[in-house]
């Protein structure tokens, strides 16, 4: 007997899609061998229609795909736009069609439902609204109008024009009689339930001259849309529930193994802890549609998701819903990168952000996830030279090391910097990753003075002390601007005396500014790197003032008590924070992240190439 397993029978209707899962023993050989779906011929052969090696028959062009999930030992064949011609016997299998590693599947596609002997068929999705129209003749215009539901052999009254409403329909049904010109009444049922499905009879009048009309109501559960995304990547659920629920609370929930649907996020402010820092529910449109973005996809995120609308913000019978089945592919194209980066107060972090290497020219962005309301992610920096005002001098986005990775450096860390940050581009929206910055106990490794004042026309020397742990690293000074940090010449002045228990491998590297001009004012960073991978940095603000007395200035660590110009960072931090714009293009329906940025955040410039390093700031 074959070890392959799958559905023996699949029944569907014209126009539908099917998703056929075939199971195989997940041995190393099986995981990597060819997977196929073929149609059995009358004389015993089996003609390949689609395979995992990229072949797609002309019969399936544009309407089928085959996806392998080696970690689960399954592959899935999706076939859309079914017709009755697709009915037949098929095999799903591994290896070569004629060998025995296969499973027989019978696919039967029947005609869709139509009108049956004067019965009007209403096919409506669960939770939506149906209007059943009932014509009548003039002689019954003044007579009682009613709607019955056939339960077994007996018709049960649902609603009538005298005000009766069956308790099963309370609060969600009404009977409308059109103006005198139209000989029609209609019954509107909202929040449709599966139990509402069945045969209905509407009637005008109660005697032998009454007008009757049959209706067949079919209530469909939404077919889950199949969504395949990569581990560590991102998914967007677009939820369009219709304008009738525009003002009702919205939710996204994930169905557990039972019938419960656990809320992932809703518009009432609820959010599941497992999605903290990696989910955004974007603002609703006027038509009631919204979308939810989840980044940093994990294996356990796979499953069935429902979005819906209900005043409770969770799934209830009668909620209009949309469904998705999310598969998370563990053979991901998105490389592993640390999900947590640690730094110390006053220190720095260097975050590596992956992007699709085919999109090296895309604009890179870094934003700070905020959990308030439904979540948002105001931009902090981009690769085109824009930096949010309160991050000037301490944040840089560098194109290095390139080839699928960019680097973000943040220094002068405070406890307020702890939180979740997203790396993204205006290209492939699936490549959105999340990193959490944690501020831990400890001292910064690099020691620099606090704010420094230089005198016009004189020479300024600024020291940076590197402990011995960085002996093998390249040490540098650079001047920060919106486009990165331009390297400056520096002098190695031998071992540093700033560290206890640190040997000759510690280093004092100084920055020298000769004949200081006004243009020298600004932020300077000293840091370490290995090739194109950046490590820790420390920042010093150099102010320039008029000459008071002659001479050159050396700055020592004694002046380093005050934190670097925290006034600049603090003033207006909360004020500007609240002006951050919810960027509509942070959602996958549009490729680009908007250029509409917080105008309060200062002028645009242009962020350049810089560099990157292992994740972890001053805590190594």
């Amino acid at each position: 007997k074959s070890p392959i397993f799958g559905p023996e029978e699949v029944n569907s209707v014209e126009g539908n899609s099917v998703s056929i899962t075939c199971y195989y023993p997940p041995t190393s050989v099986n995981r990597h061998t060819r997977k196929y779906w073929c149609r059995q011929g009358a004389r015993g052969g089996c003609i390949t229609l689609i395979s995992s090696e990229g072949y797609v028959s002309s019969k399936y062009a544009g309407r089928a795909n085959l996806t392998n999930f080696p970690e689960n030992g399954t592959f899935v064949v999706n076939i859309a736009q079914l017709s009755q011609d697709d009915s037949g016997r098929y095999k799903c299998g591994l290896g070569i069609n004629s060998r025995g590693l296969s499973f027989d599947v019978s696919l039967e596609v029947s005609q869709g439902p139509g009108l049956l002997n004067d019965t009007k068929v209403y096919t409506v999705d669960l939770g939506r609204t149906v209007t059943i129209n009932c014509p009548f003749k003039t002689e019954n215009a003044q007579k009682r109008k009613s709607l019955y539901k056939q339960i077994g052999l007996y018709p049960v009254l649902v609603i009538d024009s005298s005000g009766y409403v069956n308790p099963n329909y309370t609060g969600r049904i009404r009977l409308d009689i059109q103006g005198t010109g139209q000989l029609l009444f209609s019954v509107v049922i909202n929040q449709l339930r599966l139990s509402d499905a069945g045969q209905y009879l509407c009637q005008a009048g109660d005697d032998s001259n009454s007008n009757k009309k049959n209706a067949d109501l079919q209530v469909l559960k939404p077919e889950p849309e199949l969504v395949y995304e990569d581990l560590r990547g991102s998914v967007t659920f677009h939820c369009a529930l219709g304008p009738e629920v525009a003002n009702v609370a919205k939710f996204l929930c994930r169905q557990s193994s039972g019938e419960n649907c656990d809320v992932v996020v809703n518009t009432l402010g609820k959010r599941a802890p497992a999605f903290e820092g990696r989910i955004l529910l974007n603002p609703q449109d006027k038509d009631g549609s919204f979308s939810v973005v989840i980044t940093g996809l994990r294996k356990e995120d796979a499953g069935r998701y429902l979005c819906g609308a209900h005043s409770d913000g969770q799934l209830q019978e009668g909620s209009p819903i949309q469904a998705w089945q999310l598969f998370v592919n563990e053979e991901s194209t998105i490389p592993r990168s640390p999900t947590v980066v640690k730094g110390v107060a006053g220190g720095s972090v260097a975050v590596l952000c992956p992007y699709n290497r085919k999109e090296s020219k895309s604009i890179k962005y870094w934003c700070l996830w905020e959990g308030a309301q439904n979540g948002r992610c105001p931009l902090l920096v981009d690769s085109e030279g824009w930096v949010k005002a309160q991050y000037e001098g301490r944040l840089s986005l560098l194109e290095e090391p390139g080839n699928g990775t960019f680097t973000v450096i943040l220094n002068q860390l405070t406890s307020r910097d702890a939180g979740f940050y997203w790396c993204l581009t205006n290209g492939d929206t699936l490549w959105r990753t999340t990193v959490e910055i944690k501020i831990i106990e400890g001292e910064p490794n690099l020691k620099v003075p606090g704010n420094v004042t230089a005198v016009l026309g004189e020479t300024l020397k600024v020291p940076c002390h590197f402990p011995c742990k960085f002996s093998s690293y390249e040490k540098y000074w650079c001047k920060w601007n919106n486009t990165g940090c331009q390297a400056l010449p520096s002098q190695d002045e031998g071992p540093s005396k700033a560290f206890v228990n640190c040997d000759e491998n510690s280093r004092l590297v100084s920055l020298t500014l000769n004949l200081v001009t006004r243009a020298d004012e600004g932020w300077y960073w000293c840091g370490v790197k290995q090739g194109h991978f950046y490590g820790e940095t420390a920042a010093v603000y150099v102010a320039v003032e008029e000459r008071k007395a002659a001479g050159s200035r050396d700055v020592s660590l004694a002046k380093a008590d005050a934190a670097p110009d925290e006034k600049v960072l603090d003033s207006g931090f909360r004020e500007i924070e609240n002006k951050a714009i919810q960027d509509p293009r942070l959602f996958a329906e549009e490729k680009a992240v908007a250029d509409t940025r917080d105008q309060a955040d200062g002028s645009r410039a242009s962020v350049d190439s810089g560099s990157s390093e292992e994740q972890g700031g001053s805590s190594r």
Epitope: F5, P7, N11, L220, Q255, R304, L306, L315
Partner: nanobody
Framework: EVQLVESGGGLVQAGDSLRLSCAAS????????MGWFRQAPGKDREFVAT??????????YYADPVKGRFTISRDNAKNTVYLQMNSLKPEDTAVYYC?????????????????WGQGTLVTVSS
């Protein structure tokens, strides 16, 4: 919660037929999977057949020993699943359990099903 009630079990002769029914009630509007497992005396519970659905599409899965003899079907309006058992054999003797869930990644695995009925006994004498 979902309640499942099986019926239709009994004593039959080898070669006879039997039809089991399972009626679901309660929070069935998120049920997309219903199936049958069985447990013979002194043995582990084993997969028999499962039907999963999505809109108007049904998928039917069967265990090898019952292929070609058993047929699973459902009546959506009645929230009921049926197991038509033909050409019964003495080795089909077991307690048959109805089960349901929202979604299963592998229909053969009993731990993936959230709800179980009390079971109905089928005895096939030779």
């Amino acid at each position: 919660e979902v309640q499942l009630v099986e019926s239709g079990g009994g004593l039959v002769q080898a070669g006879d037929s039997l039809r089991l029914s399972c009626a679901a009630s309660g929070r069935t509007f998120t049920t997309y999977v219903m199936g049958w497992f069985r447990q013979a005396p002194g043995k582990d519970r084993e997969f028999v057949a499962t039907i999963t659905w999505s809109g108007s599409t049904n998928y039917k899965y069967y265990a090898d020993p019952v292929k070609g003899r058993f047929t699973i079907s459902r009546d959506n309006a009645k929230n009921t699943v049926y197991l038509q058992m033909n050409s019964l054999k003495p080795e089909d003797t077991a307690v048959y359990y109805c089960t349901s869930s929202t979604v299963v990644t592998d229909p053969r695995k009993l731990n993936e099903y959230a709800y179980w009925g009390q079971g109905t006994l089928v005895t096939v004498s030779s």
